[in-house]
């Protein structure tokens, strides 16, 4: 058994080596974004990633080309919920230093939950998306 | 070397099918998202189909649906398309292509081609 | 499916000019998934530029590539005699991966 786990931790790591999580960070990205838009953020405000989305992608064009590749990329996972998780942690690893406040965090955490679900997917059991301070990006 | 080698091609009449292979070597094939892209004569490039790392996901441009169908064997480092009730409209080279991204920022895109096989399809 | 209109059809120009070849799509585009690529004749596609603006390895830095949503632009600053070719932008964001129809750079 205890081989089995270290084969499947293996596979696992090497199919999140070749996976792009871009697109689903970009995507969840946009969703926060646009909720903020309509409470009155500026929606013109800087950012430092060059695929962050435009004002004009924000209000929903090109969105879902983000979520299609998304969803494909997580499909991936689809057989091994351990390794979905993982993918869900370091989407959320990879995004935590992005996140304003404590509010946007929150709101992020909720729609990286929803994400395989939103992909027609298993969303995996108990995954803790919980970043430690000061996370640093694994991609 | 990295190198994608598309054979199967060939004259077959209208309604009639072709099985196209593309044999990949140089890189570790089950790590890529694979396409198939043709090109009629005189024409320009037109997307057919795409399949992704594990087959779990997989596209076809709607001119093609429900009668070409895409596939891998990962262990034999092999792409595959089956071509069913060919029409005239089918004349074109066949590319093979791999599809990577950029790591840091998320872009795909195809950087891997073969050199193409033709199919011809005439009475 | 998304529709990419390229422009002009033919580029009749000689070398050491400047060469600004058009792209447009029926629906907004992520600048993540707009890609040109550089066909010569009897050849398979070359990739160019990859997520609108970055070049691909070995890509000279006379080529250049910008826009975002529906408009998005190749540039190649000072022709050389290998530029002339035909060139395609492609959208892989949304199945259909589309492909524009393409523009013949020729030497006038």
């Known amino acids: 058994r205890q081989q089995w786990e270290l084969q499947g931790d293996r596979r696992c790591q090497s199919q999140l080596e070749r996976a792009n999580l871009r697109p689903c960070e970009q995507h969840l990205m946009q969703k926060i974004q646009r909720d903020e838009d309509s409470y009155g953020r500026d929606p013109y405000s800087p950012s430092q990633d060059p695929y962050s989305p435009s004002p004009y992608d924000r209000r929903g064009a090109g969105s879902s080309q983000h979520q299609e590749r998304c969803c494909n990329e997580l499909n991936e996972f689809e057989n091994n919920q351990r390794c979905m998780c993982e993918a869900l942690q370091q989407i959320m690893e990879n995004q935590s230093d992005r996140l304003q406040g404590r509010q946007q965090e929150q709101q992020f955490k909720r729609e990286l939950r929803n994400l395989p679900q939103q992909c027609g997917l298993r969303a995996p059991q108990r995954c803790d998306l919980e970043v430690e301070s000061g996370g640093r990006d694994r991609y | 070397e990295v190198q994608l080698v598309e054979s199967g091609g060939g004259l077959v009449q209208p309604g009639g099918s072709l099985r196209l292979s593309c044999a990949a070597s140089?890189?570790?094939?089950?790590?890529?998202?694979m396409n198939w892209v043709r090109q009629a004569p005189g024409k320009g490039l037109e997307w057919v189909s795409s399949i992704t790392r594990s087959s779990r996901t997989i596209y076809y441009a709607d001119s093609v649906k429900g009668r070409f169908t895409i596939s891998r064997d990962n262990a034999k480092n092999s792409l595959y398309l089956q071509m069913n009730s060919l029409r005239d409209e089918d004349t074109a080279v066949y590319y093979c292509a791999r599809e990577d991204f950029d790591v840091s920022t998320g872009p795909y895109y195809m950087d891997v081609w073969g050199k193409g096989t033709t199919v011809t399809v005439s009475s | 499916e998304i529709v990419l209109t390229q422009s002009p059809g033919t580029l009749s120009l000689s070398p050491g000019e400047r060469a600004t070849l058009s792209c447009r799509a029926s629906?907004?585009?992520?600048?993540?998934?707009l890609v040109w690529y550089q066909q010569k004749p009897g050849q398979a596609p070359r990739l160019l530029m990859y997520?609108?603006?970055t070049r691909a390895t070995g890509i000279p830095d006379r080529f250049s590539g910008s826009g975002s949503g529906t408009d998005f632009t190749l540039t190649i600053s000072r022709l050389e005699p290998e530029d002339f070719a035909v060139y395609y932008c492609?959208?892989?964001?949304?199945?259909?991966?589309?492909f524009g129809q393409g523009t013949k750079l020729e030497i006038k």
């Open positions: 140089g890189f570790i094939f089950s790590d890529y998202n």
């Open positions: 997520g609108a603006s």
């Open positions: 492609q959208q892989n964001g949304n199945s259909p991966y589309t």
């Open positions: 629906q907004s585009v992520s600048n993540m998934f």
